[in-house]
Interface confidence: low
């Protein structure tokens, strides 16, 4: 844009410039090319020799301008159209400027301390004749000159007539500036343009309120000689909690948030979260919802999952293995990172579940006890003749540290006894003869405990290598047995199971097999008190 320092057309009153001598330049009323009334200066002393008529403008503050443009609109009479003026008429005039710190007043232009500096000799591209004058064809000339760089606070213009017939229709003085603007959310101040031949003026911008630039690199623009901004470098971005609206940053309204300057617009709060304030940088989770530390602010708030569904188990007693399987929780809490954790409790055979204690390190979990993604697990090394409660908890990224002990679990209670209460090394071979074998074992239920007196034992045996279907069976009410009528020097497989008599007998499993070889006919009996 142009910053006008002087525009003679803008004045309706007299311009009141200084004319010396007084019979030289004369201020008169006229009109511009649009018929608007204006004040002009004219001189036409073409018939008299040695003309030296000066016209000095008032003092012109240069403002921020260093390179100043002077635009002159004038008409000039063709000397050949003026009879008798051939020797004295001129078709040019001179323009000067005089830099000063203050108004010189109305003194003689060349007496101002420093000498006026000539800008140029101005000639008309088109001059008018007497005929044009009669037809009111005033041929307007426009000339623009540049002065500077200026260093003082202001200046006067001076016009020297040396014998022309000239009318100054308009004098306009201005400098070009790049107007104050907001570009890329940065404000740039009005900046005076340099000369057309100089480099661009680099200007640092200031980020608008609630915006920020790249650290250490403010946005910059370059003011060109024509007063246009060029070559923007960098931009500001609305800060977290604010979004761009035209040339400014406005707060995210309630229900919206913006986490980073890198995002252009506020976003609606993710599911199950809210932002009650303006300019929110994140949304707060609703009650009972949370985000995990690894969730981004854009993630929906989630909650711990419900319990696993349809927990089922199968118990095999030879060997003693508890297999569990379950279905995913009905409500995953809105997350995909559901895992499962198992808690094993060993409880008394009777009485409340409160009489339970952790199973301890003896029990093994396959594939693992915690962090399961599988929906199945196996428990090994359970004790026979015990009651176990196994809890399967569903966890996700927002489950608290105590969640596995919380309420989002399913549980089963399983009794492993009284059948097959022994490990293989707990059955003793008390006596081995050619035709008999005596075995003993500890009682699965402590003597005197309820049900202990009712326990019966069933011993199944068969020759090793023979079909298992060809077994023989004996029963006993005590934890010891002697099996007779065996073949000498023959390897037998023995299996024992225990149960209270009744319909549930068939459901019990035999303990792990042990093998015993009867002695040959010549061998004497042996008593072996150590475990087999």
């Amino acid at each position: 844009e142009e910053v006008i320092l002087l525009d003679s057309k803008a004045s309706q009153a007299e311009l009141g410039w200084t004319a010396l001598p007084s019979n030289g330049w004369e201020e008169i009323s006229g009109v511009d090319e649009h018929d608007r009334p204006i004040r002009t200066y004219q001189v036409c002393n073409v018939l008299e020799p040695n003309q030296d008529n000066w016209l000095q403008t008032g003092w012109i503050s240069r403002g921020r301008g260093q390179r100043i443009f002077v635009e002159l609109q004038f008409t000039l009479r063709d000397c050949s159209s003026i009879p008798g003026a051939a020797g004295t008429c001129k078709e040019t005039f001179n323009v000067y400027y005089l830099e000063t710190e203050a108004d010189l007043g109305r003194g003689r232009p060349r007496l101002g301390g420093s000498r006026p500096r000539k800008i140029d000799t101005i000639a008309a591209d088109e001059s008018f004749t007497q005929g044009d004058l009669g037809e009111r064809k005033m041929k307007l000339n426009t000339e623009v000159r540049e002065i500077g760089p200026l260093s003082r606070r202001g200046f006067h213009l001076a016009f020297q007539d040396v014998g022309a017939c000239v009318a100054l229709v308009s004098v306009r003085v201005y400098y070009k500036q790049c107007r104050a603007t907001v570009r890329g959310l940065a404000t740039f101040p009005a900046t005076a343009a340099e000369s057309a031949f100089s480099t661009l003026v680099e200007v640092a911008g200031t980020c608008v309120a609630h915006s920020e630039g790249e650290p250490g690199s403010p946005p910059r623009m370059h003011c060109g000689a024509d007063g246009e901004w060029l070559v923007p470098v960098g931009r500001c971005s609305c800060s977290a909690g604010f979004q761009e609206r035209g040339d400014f940053c406005e707060a995210c309204p309630p229900g919206f948030y913006k986490v980073s300057p890198r995002r252009p617009l506020c976003s609606p709060c993710p599911e199950h979260s809210r932002a009650l304030e303006n300019a929110s940088t994140f949304c707060v989770c609703q009650d009972s919802y949370a985000r995990s530390p690894t969730d981004p602010p854009s993630a929906s708030c989630t909650r711990p999952p419900s319990a696993p569904r349809d927990l089922q188990y199968s118990l095999s007693r030879s060997p003693l293995v508890l297999r569990l399987r379950w279905l995913p929780p009905a409500d995953s809490g809105g997350r995909s990172d559901v895992t499962y954790s198992l808690l094993c409790l060993r409880c008394g055979r009777e009485g409340p579940a409160g009489a339970c204690e952790p199973c301890g390190p003896r029990v093994a979990f396959l594939p693992r006890q915690a962090g399961l993604r599988e929906r199945a697990a196996t428990l090994l090394h359970l004790r026979p003749g015990a009651r176990y409660t196994v809890r399967v908890a569903a966890l996700n990224g927002v489950s608290g540290p105590a969640a596995a002990a919380g309420t989002t679990y399913a549980q089963v209670t399983v009794s492993t006894g009284p059948g097959a209460p022994w490990e293989e090394d707990e059955i003793r071979r008390d006596r081995v003869e050619p035709q008999s074998v005596s075995l003993s074992w500890r009682e699965p239920i402590p003597a005197g405990a309820p049900g202990a007196n009712d326990t019966e034992y069933e011993i199944r045996y068969y020759e090793k290598g023979q079909s298992e279907q060809t077994y023989s069976m004996v029963k006993t009410g005590a934890p010891t047995v002697t099996v007779t009528n065996l073949k000498p020097a023959t390897r037998y497989v023995f299996q024992i199971r225990a149960a209270s008599p009744g319909p549930s007998w068939e459901a019990q499993s035999f303990n792990p097999s042990i093998e015993v070889q009867t002695l040959g006919e010549a061998a004497s009996g042996s008593r072996d008190q150590s475990p087999a």
């Epitope: 570009r183 890329g184 035209g246 406005e250 995210c252 919206f256 506020c266 976003s267």
Partner: antibody, heavy 119, light 112 residues
Framework: QVTLKESGPTLVKPTQTLTLTCTFS??????????VGWIRQPPGKALEWLAH???????RYNPALKSRLTITKDTSKNQVVLTMTNMDPVDTATYYC???????????WGQGTLVTVSS | DIVMTQTPLSLSVTPGQPASISCRSS???????????LNWYLQKPGQSPQLLIY???NRFSGVPDRFSGSGSGTDFTLKISRVEAEDVGVYYC?????????FGQGTKLEIK
């Protein structure tokens, strides 16, 4: 498919208040960058922008008419309502609602509704 | 307010021939992001306006490639490389840089 439809009275008396409803589908005013505006066109004349409302309830009005205009939205109903008070016969025009999106600007228009102001 | 001036106001073109419409704004339409929010619309007889070009030169989806836009600052042009019968109607430019948004007065395109 984006569609907008204007509804409201076809005839109002001078000094009365005009209430127009824009019902839209194919987009949501809860989506960042979306807006809905009102534009009118007197018979045989050019278009004149009246008001706009964006997803975050920011509103802009034509300064020449601002004292007479109110624009509101109901995101759940996919509706935008424009009220214009103190109607005059010179307000006779076809009133259009139109969607604004980022970056295209005013991109989809309703079919328009002709409102005649006459006693 | 920004004044949008379209020229010519009417245009009669033979099918297959090119057409050009000018739109001039009273101030620069480049905003602080460096974007120029100048759109072109066609209003066919009895219909609502439809977007042809947005941001000076971007064709909207479904707009034939015979339509193109150009310009910067304050001077903008819509060109139709080969006019077809279906192109008749009134063409409007719209600036969305400054509030109030303002339209040009329209250019009526007819087929010879």
């Amino acid at each position: 498919q984006v569609t907008l439809k204007e509804s409201g009275p076809t005839l109002v008396k001078p000094t009365q208040t005009l209430t127009l409803t824009c019902t839209f589908s194919g987009f949501s005013l809860s989506t960042s960058g979306m807006g809905v505006g009102w534009i009118r066109q007197p018979p045989g004349k050019a278009l004149e922008w009246l008001a706009h409302i964006w997803w975050d309830d920011v509103k802009r009005y034509n300064p020449a008419l601002k004292s007479r205009l109110t624009i509101t939205k109901d995101t759940s109903k996919n509706q935008v309502v424009l009220t214009m008070t103190n109607m005059d016969p010179v307000d006779t025009a076809t009133y259009y609602c139109a969607r604004t999106s980022f970056p295209a600007g005013v991109d989809y228009w309703g079919q328009g509704t002709l409102v005649t102001v006459s006693s | 307010d920004i004044v949008m001036t379209q020229t010519p106001l009417s245009l009669s073109v033979t099918p297959g021939q090119p057409a050009s419409i000018s739109c001039r704004s009273s101030q620069s339409l480049q905003n602080s992001n460096g974007n120029t929010r100048l759109n072109w619309y066609l209003q066919k007889p009895g219909q609502s306006p439809q977007l042809l070009i947005y941001r000076v030169s971007n064709r909207f989806s479904g707009v034939p490639d015979r339509f193109s836009g150009s310009g910067s600052g304050t001077d903008f042009t819509l060109k139709i490389s080969r006019v077809e019968a279906e192109d008749v109607g009134v063409y409007y430019c719209l600036q969305e840089t400054h509030v109030p948004f303002t339209f040009g007065q329209g250019t009526k395109l007819e087929i010879k």
